[in-house]
Amino acid sequence: IWELKKDVYVVELDWYPDAPGEMVVLTCDTPEEDGITWTLDQSSEVLGSGKTLTIQVKEFGDAGQYTCHKGGEVLSHSLLLLHKKEDGIWSTDILKDQKEPKNKTFLRCEAKNYSGRFTCWWLTTISTDLTFSVKSSRGSSDPQGVTCGAATLSAERVRGDNKEYEYSVECQEDSACPAAEESLPIEVMVDAVHKLKYENYTSSFFIRDIIKPDPPKNLQLKPLKNSRQVEVSWEYPDTWSTPHSYFSLTFCVQVQGKSKREKKDRVFTDKTSATVICRKNASISVRAQDRYYSSSWSEWASVPCS
Amino acid sequence: RNLPVATPDPGMFPCLHHSQNLLRAVSNMLQKARQTLEFYPCTSEEIDHEDITKDKTSTVEACLPLELTKNESCLNSRETSFITNGSCLASRKTSFMMALCLSSIYEDLKMYQVEFKTMNAKLLMDPKRQIFLDQNMLAVIDELMQALNFNSETVPQKSSLEEPDFYKTKIKLCILLHAFRIRAVTIDRVMSYLNAS
């Protein structure tokens, strides 16, 4: 058993049929010595008396809010949560496996630049009685500070018969140099509590590996005289690290119709303009990627050909 | 400690071309190592990230773009002194700081070159003959060093009398290649910045 936060405790249980469970001793936070009784949740049934209560925790029915009272007055609470371990593996029932970039990916993180700011998100099908708490650091043995905000519900989607909820959190490394060469990864730890179930999820990454620039901005077209060709120009996204001559991007320019199966014109360039062949009912799209360290491409920025 | 936006001569950047070749060569070599050594811990997640130039050179700090010198987190650098005559430099107009930066890059390359050559000598003794360093990568390091053209004491190639542990050597190769790729990215950024300045 360990303390998650004040008056909230996590009991770690090996979860298999007829498991013995864990013996837990609760102590009432009071100077009083006698006349103390214990109850669980809203029940008025007295579970025991005395300053300490010893319980055998085996299943979710044994978890919950234990309260010690004296003469009708509440003295203190202890909330017990369960953390299940099945076949030596901690349960991951609360969050959905996003399977990208690999299986058992519950947390996904992205950074728009090298400033040390990043966003992580996760998915669940659970809609109520759910809380998250996020901590982060650079490195684990001698951790350096990363400050994370509160996790918020950022999107709701319908997937077949199920509703899916996306939560996200923004974090900022306390003293980040955009030009630094990372040798210690960022660690992100998410505590998830659903009713009386506790789970924790972690992710470890270098900012350089989770870079995904915003799409290029201000796409403009200029038809070339006596030609089917069009000059398309754009600018670096505002959120990208500066100076741009140091933090350079490379671009992919594509002309394509509405269907991905349609024919296309595609060209890669380090410049902020390119010449392509425009077709009726097609769109010109441009996306960006760090020129020197191949992490993710940005989403496409598009303009119609006509 | 930073690169001022001085205007280099047009002839400044044979180094840009060489640095692009360097990044390409080390990336290819790393990819080859990851494929060949698939049953060794050779991915970014599996290895320890070590920097053999730590406390010996200060390339990131010495080559910091002017715009980032206002960022205090970028300025916790160590004092290091370097030689200052290089052919990538924009003749006499080049600032002292730029010379420091380029000579720091030169020192990095020299250290990695020695490590890679020592390691290759060991890998050549491996009866499995599983992996060797790409000669192209070694040649590209040499070309960039020549383009930088700093005079500096030659570092003797480390020789070892004991029987090499090939497993450890291959893991060290992965660690070195990952670190060198990151440094090659920095070098490419610096050369691009200088070229644009």
């Epitope: 089917r228 014109d265 595609r266 890669f268 010449t275 077709r279 | -």
Partner: antibody, heavy 118, light 107 residues
């Protein structure tokens, strides 16, 4: 299986024209760009131009501009390349090529040898 | 027009040995570079597109690298069927242009 089948070899006199055909099978004809590339005996490859069969748009290499015409007939899934004012240096194997991507070729025809000789 | 220069023009190689062909562009072309193989009496066949992207059906011993002006086609271990002429082609701008070709011959 996508195939491009070209017309047979031709012998032409200098100053005349030649029209080479390229019939596509497998896949929808208008879903691909069609190009023409030539190769003089013992020489390298030379791009001549492309057509978008969907709308008839064409683009020619400046070297051949005014002398080459690329057309396409959607009803027969056939593309044509006509080269006029032939000279001896036009002796070459002419390939039609196609792709959904405009700027390179994933399938080429078997080639048509055009010999220009007096 | 962008001029593509291949080297060497002739490459004698022992079967089983690796081979590398270089292609240089007269100006920067990013990764807009494609490689073809041509055997005598046959049409060219696409091997690699956009500098390093492999084509399904092409053996994995063929790989491409490079960006900007310098590109390399590598055959990790030459098989008898790989003796042919190899061409690079730029698609950065029209007109599309090819290298002169590199003939890989049996040593």
């Amino acid at each position: 299986q996508v195939q491009l089948v070209q017309s047979g070899a031709e012998v032409k006199k200098p100053g005349s024209s030649v029209k080479v055909s390229c019939k596509a099978s497998g896949g929808t004809f208008s879903d691909y760009y069609l190009h023409w590339v030539r190769q003089a005996p013992g020489q390298g490859l030379e791009w001549m131009g492309w057509i978008d069969p969907e709308n008839g748009d064409t683009e020619y290499a400046p070297k051949f501009q005014g002398r080459v015409t690329i057309t396409a007939d959607e009803s027969t899934s056939t593309a044509y390349m006509e080269l006029s004012s032939l000279r001896s240096e036009d002796t070459a194997v002419y390939y039609c090529a196609r792709n959904k991507e405009l700027r390179y070729f994933d399938v080429l025809g078997q080639g048509t040898l055009v010999t220009v000789s007096s | 027009d962008i001029v593509m220069t291949q080297s060497p023009l002739s490459l004698p190689v022992t079967p089983g040995e690796p081979a590398s062909i270089s292609c240089r562009a007269s100006q920067s072309i990013s990764i807009n570079l494609h490689w073809y193989q041509q055997k005598p009496g046959q049409a060219p066949r696409l091997l690699i597109y956009f500098a390093s992207q492999s084509i399904s059906g092409v053996p994995s011993r063929f790989s491409g690298s490079g960006s900007g002006t310098d590109f390399t086609l590598t055959i990790s271990s030459l098989q008898p069927e790989d003796f042919a002429t190899y061409y690079c082609q730029q698609s950065n701008s029209f007109p599309l242009t090819f290298g002169q070709g590199t003939k890989v011959e049996i040593k």
